[in-house]
Interface confidence: medium
Amino acid sequence: IIPVEEENPDFWNREAAEALGAAKKLQPAQTAAKNLIIFLGDGMGVSTVTAARILKGQKKDKLGPEIPLAMDRFPYVALSKTYNVDKHVPDSGATATAYLCGVKGNFQTIGLSAAARFNQCNTTRGNEVISVMNRAKKAGKSVGVVTTTRVQHASPAGTYAHTVNRNWYSDADVPASARQEGCQDIATQLISNMDIDVILGGGRKYMFRMGTPDPEYPDDYSQGGTRLDGKNLVQEWLAKRQGARYVWNRTELMQASLDPSVTHLMGLFEPGDMKYEIHRDSTLDPSLMEMTEAALRLLSRNPRGFFLFVEGGRIDHGHHESRAYRALTETIMFDDAIERAGQLTSEEDTLSLVTADHSHVFSFGGYPLRGSSIFGLAPGKARDRKAYTVLLYGNGPGYVLKDGARPDVTESESGSPEYRQQSAVPLDEETHAGEDVAVFARGPQAHLVHGVQEQTFIAHVMAFAACLEPYTACDLAPPAGTTD
């Protein structure tokens, strides 16, 4: 389907001239940032961004690629090198250390320099690195963490935790020897390492003692508390803070976010990760956009500003399953959250960054016609005379043989939300990829986001923009609208 107007060179010349005009008007804001927001699309490589853009456009009855995502409208872009100190292809723990703390670490460790070794508790002490969120809190800002995964998961944990093993969610996951050496589980660190004003996501089961029934699934033992130390971490968190509230469903979240007496808010909406957006019960669980809005309502009360981490964490999970439908619909909700945050904040005083921790071996090819479904088939047949999808994975559970050969695929099969795209190599889980990912930036000091940078640069840009350690002598004009 070729739009008639696009056949005319004037269309493209005019469109490019408008973009050029906008580019020429770009004025780097020389003020400091009052607020910092980092939007982290877990596993959101460039192919994911492109495919999600097309899907979001097609959901609006457009052809697809011509409609910009909210993140596409950010004026500054860079590439981020995502490798870990010990791995070409990284995990979400060590990458979180890089973009949140400004230091690269080893695979599957969080909040620790590369002097710490995976799973070796005794290498923790002395190798802790401090997140920008922690530095923002020390500077008097309010801070928040919002995610669609467990709040103890690798990416959000990078804002507050220090652990040699990202899988140590609750004390039940920590080996007895490591517990004896003083290594704390991530859930314990969530409530004790620093004062977080807003915590929203999944992960209820890691907060309560073994045998505590889950409020949403009271008869399902597997969803109940996991802790062996007998602690109720939610109760401990509430007891330490006046004006603190704990919620576990959407209705309570909405009420709490509008209540001026609530100063601290913890919302845990599932025992583990939150449900995929396509599976979410909208009466019980908030969307990522709703959680982001609730967090911004609370955090923006602080005249000194805030730091907010927002993660679309299940983009990654959809890709690991080789289910592109899940990954892309999660990306669209993530983009919706970015758009809503943009409406609720001002680029005059808020530095917003959008990036990914790593990519996935997810490809988009095969010369599909413009306007054809992103989940559809390539126009031609493969050498085996069978159809193939335009979205594919390099490896993963989509490798299936039927009578010793690659199975044929139909448009209706490939369009199913449950369909697993085919892969070249059979694995239980599709893997991360090692190529650079994009960093999008808007707001004060966003112009610093340029070129090809180490992933650690992201944390340093945030710290500098808000004049946080180690850039307290940033020599930037105060943020727009600041009174003190």
Epitope: K275, Y276, E277, H279, D281, S282, V400, P417
Partner: antibody, heavy 123, light 106 residues
Framework: EVKLVESGGGLVQPGGSLSLSCAAS????????MSWVRQPPGKALEWLAL??????????EYSASVKGRFTISRDNSQSILYLQMNALRAEDSATYYC??????????????WGQGTLVTVSA | DTQMTQSPSSLSASLGGKVTITCKAS??????IAWYQYKTGKGPRLLIH???TLQPGIPSRFSGSGSGRDYSFSISNLEPEDIATYYC????????FGGGTKLEIK
Amino acid sequence: EVKLVESGGGLVQPGGSLSLSCAASGFTFTDYYMSWVRQPPGKALEWLALIRNKATGYTTEYSASVKGRFTISRDNSQSILYLQMNALRAEDSATYYCARASFYYDGKVLAYWGQGTLVTVSA
Amino acid sequence: DTQMTQSPSSLSASLGGKVTITCKASQDINKYIAWYQYKTGKGPRLLIHYTSTLQPGIPSRFSGSGSGRDYSFSISNLEPEDIATYYCLQYDNLYTFGGGTKLEIK
């Protein structure tokens, strides 16, 4: 409490048509995948059709045995699921159930079922 | 389409005893298997989902295991109310039921 109540079953001649309904209550209807399943007398359960939720555009899927003859649809304003059955055959005689999916562990297992409605296709 | 082969088609066991039913999928179903109890005149009752997770309110006498293409379902300490037909269901790729197993008490 999740409740599913089927209706519309009865006796119909071969080649005829019938429309089954399933009234749903106790949950947000638009959030859930819904299916029709049948059990012919003395035979196994057989999944027939699926209609997905709002987030996935209410797309549909059918088993090979009914594709082209049966149509699944939903009235979201009234929380009613439908199965329009055309060109009925004797082998379509069965108890027909509507079922709601639950998303445990990101699957889509059929967790809630109605009591069923009996369809008999006979001359 | 994924096919499910359930065996045995019927079995007889003593009260207090244990029975095991198996289902084999025609391809890997990634643990997306459920087990149902079916009694005439009632809708099927979900007992287990995701291979081994018991539904709320289902006694621990019921259990499930397996991976890949091979799955099993067991009932221990058989009770009179366990007389029913049991079905497996794969839900990895749309839905397919097994052929059913009719359980009788000796």
